[in-house]
């Protein structure tokens, strides 16, 4: 007989076909994989299943974010008897199947990593044909993307009473420490805002009052490197404007 397990959110977890002694459904994924932005990562995933010598059609799927409902980033299908899993979906063309699903391996290569790829990924296999069955990893593998700092924005903005303030926003993982230097400043950590919700890798530092003309430099640093950018403040004395 066939038993279908359902979790509390009514998502199909897996279907177990009970027959003569056989392996149960299971998936082996590491809790976390780390890689640098711009490089490639491998998300390992192997599985066991109770259907001995299954040779029918199969589909391999990887999702991001959450199991069962998260968006698919990769999907391939292998016809009956075929060792080749033909890619049907590869988000931005950066996901490539390394493993052979016929040999219980769904491992995936992710190319040209970006900080936005830092999330959890879930592998899933579906059997169709004589046997209808599927299984998906519940906990998934966390892809931790590290990156040297990059200053994404630096600007001078007007403040009340004809004053000016400077803002510097940088990204990186680990989140970079920001420091301002400039006329009569020495080295100042300034007012560093915590990473914003949904922008976990962005850090902003503000210089609330620019008191002198000249060059102001923002430096972002973490364990992987450092980056700096500058802005120039030149006020037209006797006028209310500034050139930056």
């Amino acid at each position: 007989f066939v038993r279908t397990k359902i979790d509390t959110t009514e998502n199909l977890l897996n279907t177990e076909v009970h027959s003569s002694p056989a392996q149960r459904w299971s998936m082996q994924v590491p809790p976390e994989v780390s890689a640098e932005a711009g490089d490639a990562a491998v998300l390992p995933c192997t599985f066991t299943h109770p259907h001995r010598h299954y040779d029918g059609p199969l589909t391999a799927i990887w999702r991001a974010g959450e199991p069962y409902a998260g968006p698919q980033v990769f999907r391939c299908a292998a016809a009956r008897g075929s060792e080749l899993c033909q890619t049907a979906l590869s988000l931005h063309g950066r996901f490539r199947l390394l493993g052979n699903p016929r040999r219980n391996d769904l491992s995936l290569r992710v190319e040209r990593l970006a900080l936005a790829d830092d999330r959890r990924y879930f592998c899933r296999v579906e059997f169709a044909g004589d046997v209808h069955d599927r299984y998906e990893s519940r906990h998934g593998v966390r892809l931790h993307v590290t990156a040297a700092p990059r200053i994404v924005n630096i600007s001078v903005l007007p403040s009340p009473a004809h004053a000016f303030r400077a803002l510097c926003t940088a990204e990186g993982e680990p989140p970079p420490a920001l420091a301002w230097s400039g006329p009569a400043l020495g080295n100042s950590l300034a007012a560093v805002r915590s990473p914003r919700e949904g922008h976990g890798h962005l850090v902003t530092a503000e210089l609330p009052a620019l008191t002198h003309d000249g060059r102001y430099t923002c430096t972002a640093a973490n364990s992987l490197g450092r980056s700096e950018a500058s802005v120039y403040l030149f006020r037209f004395h006797g006028a209310s404007g500034a050139s930056t």
Partner: antibody, heavy 121, light 111 residues
């Protein structure tokens, strides 16, 4: 049986152009990435260019030594791979092989017999 | 660019002997246990033929006397007992990072 047959090689003067072709048969051409790999006389192998398939937006990749001079393309309807070679130099003299790779691995599981390109005045 | 180096340049052995060929990468070519190293055989006047992919997987139709091992930067191709048809040139290649690069090759010749 997988077959890759190159053509279009020959003698060309420095600065000249040549277009190589590779006719593929015995497999579903659309499912694979295709490559050109070259071998200078008596030397080792050098990967030249790769073109991916439709799912991978026909993305192209080149070795630094040929970037801007060579263009890889494919015609899925004709099961054919091409290499347009411009501004040829003496150091481009080699046997050019057409090679297939799976979408998951940048290794070359089938190769053609090659076509010789000689750049000389 | 990852630089690939093979040693020795030439290996002189007799049929029936064991051949051990080395391949070294200038930086690690292994990610999460997957090693992006592949081995090819080439005979004079012929195209290369894939022997081993991803360090240790035997390509289709290749005899079991060929095996591959290694991780990180150091890899080995072993031919357990040389057959007359095994005397040829052998290349390793990395696909860890583009551009994909080959080593200069090892020639296995009859002693």
């Amino acid at each position: 049986e997988v077959q890759l047959v190159e053509s279009g090689g020959g003698l060309v003067q420095p600065g000249g152009s040549l277009r190589l072709s590779c006719a593929a048969s015995g497999f579903n051409f659309n499912d694979y990435f295709m490559n050109w790999v070259r071998q200078a006389p008596g030397k080792g192998l050098e990967w030249v260019a790769q073109i991916r398939n439709k799912i991978y937006t026909y993305a192209t990749f080149y070795a630094a030594s040929v970037k801007g001079r060579f263009t890889i393309s494919r015609d899925n309807a004709k099961n054919s791979l091409y290499l347009q070679m411009n501004s040829l130099r003496a150091e481009d003299t080699a046997v050019y092989y057409c090679a297939r790779s799976l979408t998951g691995g940048d290794y070359f599981d089938y190769w053609g017999q090659g076509t010789l390109v000689t750049v000389s005045s | 660019e990852i630089l690939m180096t093979q040693s020795p340049a030439t290996l002189s052995l007799s049929p029936g002997e064991r051949a051990t060929l080395s391949c070294r990468a200038s930086q690690s070519v292994t990610i999460s246990g997957y090693s992006f190293i592949h081995w090819y055989q080439q005979k004079p006047g012929q195209a290369p033929r894939l022997l081993i992919y991803r360090a240790s997987n035997l390509a289709s139709g290749i005899p079991a006397r060929f095996s591959g091992s290694g991780s990180g930067t150091d890899f080995t191709l072993t031919i357990s007992s040389l057959e007359p048809e095994d005397f040829a040139l052998y290349f390793c290649q990395q696909s860890r990072k583009s551009p994909w690069t080959f080593a200069q090759g090892t020639k296995v010749e009859i002693k």
